[in-house]
Interface confidence: low
């Protein structure tokens, strides 16, 4: 399987909500011993490998934001810890995997990585990640709502989390 980032850049005004999204596609094994571990973290564009460094999102580590499930099952973080920080990660039946960040501040700007790990019998590891940039802006040049720029050279799109 692979991970696609629908948008490579999100530009948002302060105070807005945004949902960053990755999509898992390709063959997904639905065997009883296969599970998926999905999570989000902040990182930097390393010289060697983007997403190799794992930093917390609003003080929550990638362990705090994880989801577990088999195949393309739906799941979401419901624990208070994430919600208290204005965060929620979710996964749907179609392979979409997202994190919603509420009430954005300038401190939320940076590189975000989604990580998907296929676990077979506890250990065999197939992992892929996607990266996207979030720019939170303030002042007269800030957009009125979030604008997402697709990973390919398509037109930008206005997006705002509910």
């Amino acid at each position: 399987f692979k991970v696609a980032t629908l948008y490579s850049l999100y530009v948002c005004p302060e105070g807005q909500n945004v949902t960053l999204t990755c999509r898992v596609f390709g063959p997904v094994d639905k065997g009883h011993d296969v599970t998926f571990y999905k999570t989000w973290y902040r990182s930097s564009r390393g010289e060697v490998q983007t997403c190799s460094e794992r930093r917390p999102i609003r003080n929550l580590t990638f362990q705090d934001l994880h989801l577990h499930h088999g195949g393309h099952q739906a799941a979401n973080t419901s624990h208070d810890l994430a919600q208290r920080h204005g965060l929620e990660s979710a996964s749907d039946h179609h392979g979409n995997f997202s994190i919603t960040m509420r009430n954005l501040t300038l401190l939320d700007s940076g590189l975000y990585c989604c990580l998907v790990v296929e676990i077979r019998h506890h250990h065999s590891e197939h992992r892929v990640h996607g990266a996207m940039e979030l720019q939170v802006q303030t002042g007269k040049d800030a957009p009125s709502s979030c604008v997402a720029y697709p990973s390919s050279s398509q037109e930008s799109e206005n997006i705002t989390a509910a």
Partner: antibody
Framework: EVQLQQSGPELEKPGASVKISCKAS????????MNWVKQNNGKSLEWIGN????????TYNQKFKGKATLTVDKSSSTAYMQLKSLTSEDSAVYYC?????????????WGAGTTVTVSS | DVVMTQTPLSLPVSLGDQASISCRSS???????????LHWYLQKPGQSPKLLIY???NRFSGVPDRFSGSGSGTDFTLKISRVEAEDLGVYFC?????????FGGGTKLEIK
């Protein structure tokens, strides 16, 4: 702060069983496997096995199958290890340790250890 | 089981010296996914082990850059470029490529 708090020292008679606990705090308990490691005489380390706290899946070192049983209580974020049919060979310090990267076998947080002494 | 052999058993050093610890495995630690799961821990007297290096050469968060790991296949090395007093203790290598995970016998770093 991420912490693993282990239960206190145990003195047991040969043939008895003991159950030691490891209470996790400061992180999402189901986000990483919990491992158990035995240390004899302050020197060698032996991996006993691990448990995925989300599913309860266990993987054991063959050497400890039948000796150790790993369980978790998700509601209290606590992992347990029961050792049965104790002999003097089981006298050691036992550590719980969190797998840093979910299930890849390197441990970033360790408990302080529980000393088990088996003596008649 | 994979046997991990560490040398030397004891390593007397002077503060400021470089120290080098070797770890050999009885079989290759290259996983079928291409990763090599060889890790290093330091255990100070009366404490639990602490992760220093994971997957051969990745320094864990907060570990000083005087620690470095290298190697491949079955042959691995931990180097400390300038030994400080806080580095003293027992160093263990560990593999998690194969189940059961196994540890080396330890190398005690002590003052000469």
């Amino acid at each position: 702060e991420v912490q693993l708090q282990q239960s206190g020292p145990e003195l047991e008679k040969p043939g008895a069983s003991v159950k030691i606990s490891c209470k996790a705090s400061g992180y999402s308990f189901t986000g990483s496997n919990m491992n158990w490691v035995k240390q004899n005489n302050g020197k060698s380390l032996e991996w006993i096995g691990n448990i995925d706290p989300y599913y309860g899946y266990t993987t054991y070192n063959q050497k400890f199958k039948g000796k150790a049983t790993l369980t978790v209580d998700k509601s209290s974020s606590t992992a347990y290890m029961q050792l049965k049919s104790l002999t003097s060979e089981d006298s050691a310090v036992y550590y719980c340790a969190r797998d840093y990267d979910y299930a890849l076998g390197y441990f970033d947080v360790w408990g302080a250890g529980t000393t088990v002494t088996v003596s008649s | 089981d994979v046997v991990m052999t560490q040398t030397p058993l004891s390593l007397p050093v002077s503060l400021g010296d470089q120290a080098s610890i070797s770890c050999r495995s009885s079989q290759s630690l290259v996983h079928s996914n291409g990763n090599t799961y060889l890790h290093w821990y330091l255990q100070k007297p009366g404490q639990s082990p602490k992760l220093l290096i994971y997957k051969v050469s990745n320094r864990f968060s907060g570990v000083p850059d005087r620690f470095s790991g290298s190697g491949s296949g079955t042959d691995f090395t931990l180097k400390i470029s300038r030994v400080e007093a806080e580095d003293l203790g027992v160093y263990f290598c560990s593999q998690s490529t194969h189940v059961p995970y196994t540890f080396g016998g330890g190398t005690k770093l002590e003052i000469k």
